[in-house]
Every structure is written in C-alpha cells, then in structure tokens.
C-alpha cells in the first residue's frame, strides 16, 4: 500500500532571483483533492494553506511582498490528501539580489571575436566577497561560478557562435544573497555561415526582464514561461 503521495512541484514567480524589496510568489502544485499544503523554509514550517474547495484546486501560492535577506534561503512544500502526506518537493533556492554593490564585467580580448579565439570574462567587485557568478541570458542558461578576492576569471576557452549573447555577473555574499547585476556585456562571435546556422544565438529577453530566463522549475509543469533549467539551482547546492 502506498505510504506517501507523489512530491509536489515548487517554483517561484516571476523567478527565483528576486531583487531586494520586490515581490515574489512561491507556487506549490500538488493534486486536486489536497486538503492542506505546507510551505517549509530552512526546515521550519513557514505557512499553511487549506484550499476551498480542495477538489477544484491543485496549486497554491505563497506571497512574499518584500524580498530581503531574511526571506532568502531554501523552501520546500508538501501536501496532504485525507491523512496521507506527500513526499517533500525538491528544494527551491530563493535568492535576493541587488544587495550592496554592483560588479564590473569585462571581456578579453574584447566583445567582438572570431570563432576559435580564446575568451575570458572578468568580474570585479571591491567589497567583501570571494564568490562570483557569470550568467548568460537566454532560454538555455549558462552559469559559471568563480572565486577570487576582488575579481574572478571566467575562461570560456575557444569560443564558437554558440557563445554569442549577453552576459552579466554577480558577486555572491552567500549562496542566497547576491549583488546587483553588472552592466551587460554582449559577446559577438563571428564564424562561417555553416557554424552560424548550426549554433544560433539563444533567444534573449529585454534588459528589464533579463532575469526571467532563470526560473526555478521542474519538468512536468505545463507553463509557457516555465523554463526547465536547473543549472543555476544546482550551483547553489
């Protein structure tokens, strides 16, 4: 006999990287008929929802109106049907951004390179942090972690046209508190026509919504804006 129900999906809207003082909603999707959902934060009960009527609802939302460092951390949810509880969801890492300072992102030898050239990004932040994150905008997110006292190097190696796109970096004060994003750096890689057609540039988002490509989600949930990429989430673990 089944002792637990399948785990729910958990994700953040609009995304798991939340600028300080902005709002975010944590969503938990279980099953129709669930009489109770519980949201846990860093291992402690955070909130409870008892849907009405339960047979018409399979998803609940937990609202955070004012993101800050106290709200950043790991969230999970569970649900109950009758007396039977589900497995806990995967962990959702909620990150607060726009903390303290803004790093500077530069690229060597420059933003316009030829396919096959070696390219290195440099992220610099003078305040006390030793971890840096380089993010490439687009539907398939590319995240690298780097370390250094005030600057981290991100060698991309010999680039292809697949490396084309817009990059930003963050300083990370801890796993869940990141700096302001750097100004964007657009990398233009020129190559032959055949390579270009094989490796089109990732679709990018307008500058004011650049973070939405890094939604924290899980496969199986049909949502247009849900981009099933765990790269950044896994980096936090």
């Amino acid at each position: 006999q089944q002792q637990t129900l399948p785990k729910p999906f958990i994700w953040a809207e609009p995304h798991f990287m939340v600028p300080k003082e902005k709002q975010v909603t944590i969503c938990c999707q279980g099953n129709y008929g669930a009489v109770e959902y519980q949201l846990h934060f860093e291992g402690s009960l955070f909130a409870v929802d008892r849907p009405k009527p339960p047979e018409r609802i399979n998803k609940v939302q937990f609202y955070i109106p004012d993101m800050n460092s106290r709200m950043a951390g790991q969230y999970s949810c569970i649900y109950r049907v009758g007396e039977l509880w589900s497995e806990p969801s995967n962990l959702l890492d909620l990150v607060v951004t726009e903390m303290y300072d803004t790093p500077t992102l530069s690229v060597h030898p420059g933003p316009e390179v030829i396919s096959g050239e070696k390219v290195t990004f440099y992220c610099r932040l003078d305040t006390a942090t030793s971890m840096f994150l380089l993010l490439k905008e687009g539907r398939s997110s590319h995240v690298q972690r780097g370390y250094g006292k005030v600057q981290a190097e991100f060698p991309l190696g010999p680039v292809t046209t697949a490396h084309r796109g817009t990059y930003r970096c963050f300083g990370s004060y801890n796993n869940h508190a990141w700096s302001f994003p750097s100004e964007p750096v657009k990398l233009l890689v020129t190559g032959d026509i055949e390579n270009t057609s094989l490796a089109p540039e990732d679709p990018t988002f307008p500058a004011d919504t650049w973070g939405t490509y890094l939604l924290t989600t899980e496969t199986g949930l049909q949502k247009d804006h849900a981009l099933w990429d765990h790269t950044a989430q896994n980096l936090l673990r």
Epitope: A47, V48, D49, P65
Partner: nanobody, 127 residues
C-alpha cells in the same frame, strides 16, 4: 502601512482566562493574514496562533491547541486571542502580526512571513 496595537494583557492566575485584542489601523485589514507570537524573557519569539484573511483556516502551536482560540472581526479591524486554562508557561510578551497573502486560505506560521508587528502586551500567569 498597518499599525497594530495589542491590549488585554495583565496578571492572571493559573487556570484562568484572558482575552487579548489587536486593533489594526490602516486600510485593507481584511487582506491580511494575522498571527500571535509570544516571547518569554531570554527566549526566542515563538509562534502561538494564526488566522487567514478570511477567518478560516486557523492554525495553532501544539502547546496551546485546545486552550487558545484566535478569531477576527474584519468590520472592527481587530483580531483576538482567547486564552483559557492558562499556566505559568504562558507567561510572556504577546505580539500581534500582520502579513499579506496571495490567498485568503493561507495562514502564516513563520515570523519572517509577517511585515507588520505590534509593540506587545505582557501576560503574567501566577501559580
């Protein structure tokens, strides 16, 4: 912006009853989930009870379940904590808190989930 003012605290004998009130000023009281927390000297602030913006559901700490009742009257912008069968372990400063929720069936248990706090009212239970 919501301002919260607690009242009703005082000295009560073990086994007795007390009703705490929390009056909210500001708009949209009915949109806020409300909670009561307590803090004994030298200890952390502990969850006591919470109520959703609609008044149902409610949620209680195990230590007060069956003894305390939380309720609200949105027309009066007030939330109440009825405390029965009190014991010396209930001695603490009691705080009222308010937090916005996405749904009217959500109760908030963790203090981080509340944006607004009252100044507190002292409850002392003598044996």
């Amino acid at each position: 912006q919501v301002q919260l003012v607690e009242s009703g605290g005082g000295l009560v004998q073990a086994g007795g009853s007390l009703r705490l009130s929390c009056a909210a000023s500001g708009r949209s009281f009915s949109r806020y989930a409300m909670g009561w927390f307590r803090q004994a000297p030298g200890k952390e602030r502990d969850f006591v009870a919470a109520i959703s913006s609609s008044g149902d559901p409610t949620y209680y700490a195990d230590s007060v379940k069956g003894r305390f009742t939380i309720s609200r009257v949105n027309a009066k912008n007030t939330v109440y904590l009825q405390m029965n069968s009190v014991n010396p372990g209930d001695t603490a400063v009691y705080y009222c808190a308010a937090g916005l929720t996405a749904r009217d069936t959500t109760v908030v248990v963790h203090p981080n989930g509340y944006s607004y706090w009252g100044q507190g009212t002292q409850v002392t239970v003598s044996s």
